[in-house]
Interface confidence: low
């Protein structure tokens, strides 16, 4: 399907002008290629009428132009002095007329309506209010005032000053007669329906001296605003229906093939399951306006959307509406990224979030979509620091890999973490994306002790086990803070062939703190990554306490809390992946110093991935 998009149908009246906007993907090639407007003939050929290269056909001379807006990916065709002959089938497009990068537009130019002389024309949108003014002479001031509707050759009474109201207008019409001296009465019709359209007659008095005034009421359906968004991106529908419906339930619906309108979301708590996790109805302003955001756009989201107000929270005749025609461009600039990320209880996920690469300095955010009522998305983390306290130590937003992608890492997963999350920035709102986190059966791949207590001035070493499948990955330890996770300096990585062969003794990377200071207290993450792309992480909390007894401190499993998925059997024995390891030095390095006097190499915190035999047994 062509990625060019515009209005399917354009209607106007003889003598008027039209402005037709066509959208295209703003790639470098598309921005600079020829734009055209052509008319389809009976032969199927499309004859150029105006193009961006300056060509204007003789038929359009002096009354048409084409303007390209490359920065927006749009071009606009303006045609003035329309005649009935301009009615027909056209195309707006890019490149060569026959190439197919185009959109079909039907233009209909009609005659203006034939109205009696002196007719007042009222043009009002459906659902709105009209006030029809009816003048009269002094002698008719005491006499009956009435409004009739002309249907064919007959006139049907709509309302009169004797309190008659036509049933079709019940509860939405009133006739106002002003005080003495004002020779005009008014009829106000609320919540206009399409069926209210037509010619009306005001009358004051009767007989040959009666006053009459014709009024042509044109009730218009709102012209849909064209919206052109990228696949996987986001769209925002801003809906402003007016103060008169500020306190009425609001909705957004999508017109279906039967020409009815299915509720997408409303303020009464209804939401279409197809939009689960990717829609929000933002709270109303005082003026009753509201907005609906849809992320993770799919091709099937295309169509005509209406927003409106009604106590039932759905489309009803005679209530104000706004309309949009959404086109989802498959030639998207938004890169593919997983829409579902799976993790295991106790494990972690690393989520890649796209953003507009032109906005590398923008603030990045991650929020949790909550579906209750209209939906909300409280921020959990931002690039300047953590937002929600309950995520302390287990959530971080990283600028890497950069160039249009940032990373969010969440570990210590529980089933409560399952749900929908949104990636967003304070820049281009169209780049908001949704990811669903699912918690599946399984064990975390990285194993670390539970909470660890370190002693001031001593050395601490924390191990992190990884399986063979991570042998080619880069391993790291970092210290978590609410502004990120600061990687700790790496020490001897050990013989590389040990990792290549996945030596049984090479499957642990350890963190050494030497000597431990008060500042070392906090969360530490063990993780794996490939270049700037992050994989799994495991978190451990290090508490620091005063030194009680001078001497060496080994961190054995008995002195650390068990990780949630690991069972402490007895002092110095831990079951990891169903294999008992009976060496208290599993979670310690032989590099641990006996006292805090001299520090080896002056390094206070180090990471070691050595395959030294002294590390004892290993898991399978």
């Amino acid at each position: 399907k062509s990625p060019v998009f515009g209005p399917q149908e354009v209607s106007s009246v003889e003598g008027n002008s039209v402005s037709i906007k066509c959208y295209y993907p703003p790639t470098s090639v598309n921005r600079h290629t020829r734009k055209y407007w052509c008319r389809k003939g009976a032969s199927g050929r499309c004859i150029t009428l105006v193009s961006s290269e300056g060509y204007v056909s003789s038929n359009y001379a002096g009354r048409a132009n084409l303007t390209n807006f490359p920065e927006n990916g749009t071009f606009v065709v303006n045609i003035a002095q329309l005649s009935r002959d301009d009615s027909g089938h056209y195309k707006c497009g890019l490149g060569i007329n026959s190439r197919g990068l185009s959109f079909d537009v039907s233009l209909e130019v009609s005659q203006g309506p034939e109205l009696p002389n002196g007719t007042e024309v009222y043009t009002v949108d459906v659902g709105r209010t009209v006030t029809i003014k009816c003048p009269f002479k002094t002698e008719n001031a005491p006499k009956t005032k009435a409004l009739y509707k002309k249907i064919g050759q007959t006139s049907v009474l709509v309302i009169d000053s004797r309190n008659y109201v036509n049933p079709n207008y019940k509860d939405r019409i009133r006739l106002r007669i002003p005080g003495t001296g004002q020779l005009i009465f008014t009829v106000v019709i609320d919540r206009l329906r399409l069926s209210d359209h037509g010619l009306y007659l005001c009358q004051a008095g009767d007989g040959s001296n009666r006053d009459e005034k014709n009024a042509d009421l044109q009730v218009l359906e709102p012209e849909p605003e064209l919206v052109y968004e990228d696949l996987r991106g986001s769209v925002t529908f801003h809906c402003a229906l007016g103060l008169e419906v500020a306190n009425v339930a609001k909705f957004l619906c999508r017109v279906n093939s039967r020409e009815t309108c299915d509720v997408v979301i409303n303020t009464l708590g209804k939401r279409d399951s197809a939009f689960e996790g990717r829609i929000l109805l933002n709270p109303q302003d005082k003026d009753g306006s509201f907005s609906v955001v849809i992320t993770g756009l799919r091709k099937e989201d295309e169509g005509r959307y209406l927003c409106g107000a009604h106590s039932d929270g759905q489309l009803q005749e005679g209530w104000p509406i706004q309309a949009w025609q959404l086109f989802v461009n498959e030639e998207s600039t938004i890169p593919r990224s997983p829409t579902v990320v799976k993790g295991v209880a106790g494990g972690s996920v690393a989520v890649l979030c796209p953003y507009n690469p032109k906005e590398s300095q923008s603030l990045k955010y991650w929020c949790l979509w909550e579906g209750a009522q209209n939906g909300r998305c409280p921020l959990l983390v931002e690039s300047q620091g953590l937002v929600q306290e309950q995520y302390e130590g287990r959530l971080s937003l990283l600028q890497e890999p950069g160039n249009g992608t940032f990373t969010v890492i969440l570990n210590q997963l529980t089933t409560q973490d399952a749900g929908f999350y949104w990636c967003l920035t304070n820049g281009d709102t169209r780049w908001r994306t949704t990811v669903e986190i699912k918690i599946i059966e399984g064990e975390p791949n990285l194993k670390v002790p539970g909470n660890v207590t370190a002693v001031l001035g001593e050395t601490l070493n924390i191990p992190c086990h990884f399986p063979c499948k991570f042998s080619s990955y880069e391993k790291y330890w970092c210290k978590w803070s609410n502004t990120g996770c600061q990687t700790l300096p790496s020490q001897d990585e050990g013989p590389s062939e040990a990792f290549v062969n996945c030596d049984e003794n090479s499957r642990l990377v350890s963190l050494t703190l030497n000597p431990v200071t008060r500042a070392d207290e906090g969360w530490y993450w063990c993780g794996v990554k490939q270049g700037h792309f992050y994989g799994e992480t495991a978190a451990v909390y290090v508490a620091v306490e005063e030194k009680k007894v001078a001497g060496s401190r080994y961190v054995s499993p008995a002195k650390a809390d068990a990780a949630p998925d690991e069972k402490v059997l007895d002092s110095g024995v831990r079951e990891i992946e169903n294999k008992a390891i009976q060496d208290p030095r599993l979670f310690a390095e032989e590099k641990v110093v006996a006292d805090t006097g001299d520090q080896a190499g002056g390094s206070r915190a180090s990471v070691d991935s050595s395959s030294s035999e002294e590390q004892g047994g290993s898991s399978k």
Epitope: S12, V13, S110, Q111, G112, P113, S195, D196
Partner: nanobody, 125 residues
Framework: QVQLVESGGGLVQAGDSLRLSCAAS??????????MAWFRQAPGKEREFVAS????????YYADSVRGRFTVTRDSGKNTVTLRMNSLKPDDTAVYYC????????????????WGQGTLVTVSS
Amino acid sequence: QVQLVESGGGLVQAGDSLRLSCAASGRALSFNTYAMAWFRQAPGKEREFVASITYNGGSTYYADSVRGRFTVTRDSGKNTVTLRMNSLKPDDTAVYYCASAQYWRSGTSFPANYWGQGTLVTVSS
């Protein structure tokens, strides 16, 4: 889905009258929210607008070639629209199509979204 079925076509002499009917069914919205129109297509020619009637029957619009001779009416109770054709001419020979529109604009603007299959009217001299 909306179905429009035309009837009443046939062979008549020049100067005679004929009445075409269009019955609407299956529409999701009520009949009186649709504008209706008649179009025609003579052999070898493009389809052309004949007449239209607004949602409520309050206004009607006609092509110059038929104004004063043709009358379009609607009966919302029966979901039908009728085209009364008087003083027929050989030039009126065509297949006549009924059409509906979800939108309506003032004048003869008629963005048809559903069409009938058509009924043939032949006017002999």
